[in-house]
């Protein structure tokens, strides 16, 4: 019994005068804006996006919007076209949604914020944005009170008119409209395709958060990893950092390239490599391989408990006003606008701590 190394778990609520506001990462579920896809992009990535078949032709489709089809037919006329060099990272960067176009209003603790307060980050959804990343020498924002007025409130236009037509099922095209959001510590990178939650247009979504600080014990009392990160890419250990690290190694090993969101110096995958190797390999790793990426729990971690609720926006009463304000049709407002409110429920944090049952 003496060698059993039991532990007990202590739960505590700690009042705080202020809390560090978490990082908030958001991604449009559409990876590439239709208007930004050039003839050269279409030539190189058209098949990956299921916009072209393997003969560089627009597939026979009855699903196409006439206007979009006309534009694509013009772009897909490759007679006498000389392809230029193409780079997936540059394509994601240039054609991904721009926060300056999406962000209609932004307030943090009642003060105006702007697109400048969002840092570009690449994820499996492509070009995404993090508010309060704490990077580039910027301080981490604090909040002094709980409740909706003391957090982040943003209004976004998801720009459905820019969504790529979906003529086939690929990892780069989405059936859904909206954004994916992850609320995370500044000490860990976003892993939004796996850990994010969806926010739909036509709704104001309230996210009430509680900070939870978890303290685990290392072996033999527990199973946490006390060592610092053995990684070329991340400074501090987190399960997310470990998984991204591992997924990168897996892709480089299987495909000799990395996806645009992956760290390191391996070459970026070409569209052909995405289609033939990177997408299926990563899908296999995430869905099927239970052993390749086994990431230990860190001994200290901060997570955010969330409660979501939503109300309709716009109301019948405000539809005309918002349409006029943003110079859009009422239908456009209903299909594209969302409001996201992220705040602490109360100004305290929960500690969940493993303690040795006896010394």
């Amino acid at each position: 019994y003496y060698f059993c190394y039991h532990h007990v778990t202590k739960l505590d609520e700690v009042a705080a005068s202020q809390l560090t506001f978490p990082a908030v990462t958001l991604c449009n579920l559409n990876e590439f804006r239709f208007s930004q896809v050039s003839k050269n992009d279409l030539y190189h990535a058209g098949e990956l996006l299921a916009l072209l078949n393997n003969r560089y032709e627009i597939p026979d489709t009855q699903m196409a919007d006439e206007k979009q089809l006309e534009i694509l037919q013009d772009k897909a006329n490759f007679r006498s076209f000389k392809p230029k060099p193409f780079n997936m990272r540059e394509f994601y960067d240039r054609a991904g949604h721009d926060i300056r176009d999406m962000l209609l209003s932004c307030h943090f603790r009642g003060e105006a914020c702007s697109a400048e307060d969002f840092k570009v980050v690449f994820t499996r959804y492509g070009k995404c944005y993090t508010f309060n990343s704490g990077q580039d020498g910027r301080p981490r924002l604090k909040t002094m009170k709980g409740g909706t007025g003391n957090g982040l409130e943003i209004m976004l236009d998801i720009q459905q008119d820019e969504y790529l037509p979906v003529w086939g099922e690929t990892d780069e095209t989405s059936f859904e409209a909206g954004i994916k959001v992850q609320i995370h510590s500044q000490d860990e990178p976003p892993f939004i395709d796996q850990l994010g939650f969806g926010v739909a247009p036509g709704f104001q979504t309230f996210v009430s958060c509680q900070e939870q600080r978890l303290i685990y014990l290392p072996s033999p009392w527990g199973t946490c990893n006390a060592v610092t990160m053995d990684s070329d890419f991340f400074d501090s250990y987190s399960i997310t950092a470990c998984r991204i690290d591992c997924e990168t190694r897996y892709l480089v090993e299987n495909c000799n390239c990395r996806m645009v969101h992956m760290p390191g110096d391996a070459p970026y995958c070409t569209p052909e490599q995405y289609k033939e190797c990177a997408d299926p390999a990563l899908d296999f790793l995430v869905e099927k391989d239970q052993e390749y990426c086994v990431c230990e729990m860190p001994c200290n971690l901060t997570r955010y408990g969330k409660e979501l609720s939503m109300v309709k926006i716009p109301s019948k009463a405000s539809a005309k006003y918002l349409a006029k304000k943003f110079n859009k049709s009422e239908q456009y407002i209903g299909e594209n606008i969302l409001v996201l409110d992220i705040f602490f429920e109360v100004l305290n944090y929960e500690t969940i701590e493993q303690k040795k049952a006896y010394e």
């Epitope: 090993e253 299987n254 390999a281 790793l285 869905e287 099927k288 391989d289 052993e291 390749y292």
Partner: antibody, heavy 116, light 107 residues
Framework: EVQLLASGGGLVQPGGSLRLSCAAS????????MSWVRQAPGKGLEWVSG????????YYADSVKGRFTISRDNSKNTLYLQMNSLRAEDTAAYYC?????????WGQGIRVTVSS | DIQMTQSPSTLSASVGDRVSITCRAS??????LAWYQQKPGKAPKLLIY???NLDSGVPSRFSGSGSGTDFTLTISSLQPDDFATYYC?????????FGQGTKLEIK
């Protein structure tokens, strides 16, 4: 180049034993699950057994459970299939394969004949 | 275990024909299905993985489609080299299972 080379087949009497080996090269062997697949003469393909990258998890088809043991030595980049209590219906070409998002490559196939 | 039902078991066709072979899983396997071509005395050759991805070096006349439980291998224009036996395989979960095979023969 990724390669698998199987060996150890041959003729064995019913109730006898045989150990097949599959030597891997060109990839990080310990990172990948591996499987054995067989094909009886004139018949279709049948999955026999699988093993995780570390060797910690093993899986078997009902037809060989309790008689066959899959194992691996990651230091030698080699996969094994220990076949005991062999029966006439185990006569087949045996292939080793690397499991991943696509099963490639397959070994060249090794003939096992169980006959008295 | 997941059963894989392949049809037809034999298919007679001529050079230039368009042919399809279907494979049905007894439960959903997402897109984790592969198609192989096998010629007598040879190891199976991978044609399609993850339901619709053409393996490198495989002619574009081969294509795969489907997800969930129903899958199809299509050869758009049969060539003399295509007469062989074709197998589907699910690799969604152990025990991995193969279809019983479709023998494609010259009419």
């Amino acid at each position: 180049e990724v390669q698998l080379l199987a060996s150890g087949g041959g003729l064995v009497q019913p109730g006898g034993s045989l150990r097949l080996s599959c030597a891997a090269s060109g990839f990080t062997f310990s990172s990948f699950a591996m499987s054995w697949v067989r094909q009886a003469p004139g018949k279709g393909l049948e999955w026999v057994s699988g093993i995780s990258g570390s060797g910690g998890s093993t899986y078997y088809a009902d037809s060989v459970k309790g008689r066959f043991t899959i194992s691996r030595d990651n230091s030698k980049n080699t996969l094994y299939l220990q076949m005991n209590s062999l029966r006439a219906e185990d006569t087949a070409a045996y292939y080793c394969a690397k499991e991943a998002y696509k099963w490639q490559p397959w070994g060249q196939g090794i003939r096992v004949t169980v006959s008295s | 275990d997941i059963q894989m039902t392949q049809s037809p078991s034999t298919l007679s066709a001529s050079v230039g024909d368009r042919v399809s072979i279907t494979c049905r899983a007894s439960q959903s396997i997402s897109s984790w299905l592969a198609w192989y071509q096998q010629k007598p005395g040879k190891a199976p050759k991978l044609l399609i993985y993850k339901a619709s991805n053409l393996d490198s070096g495989v002619p574009s006349r081969f294509s795969g489609s489907g997800s969930g439980t129903d899958f199809t291998l299509t050869i758009s224009s049969l060539q003399p080299d295509d007469f062989a036996t074709y197998y589907c395989q699910q690799y969604n979960s152990y025990s991995y299972t193969f279809g019983q095979g479709t023998k494609l023969e010259i009419k």
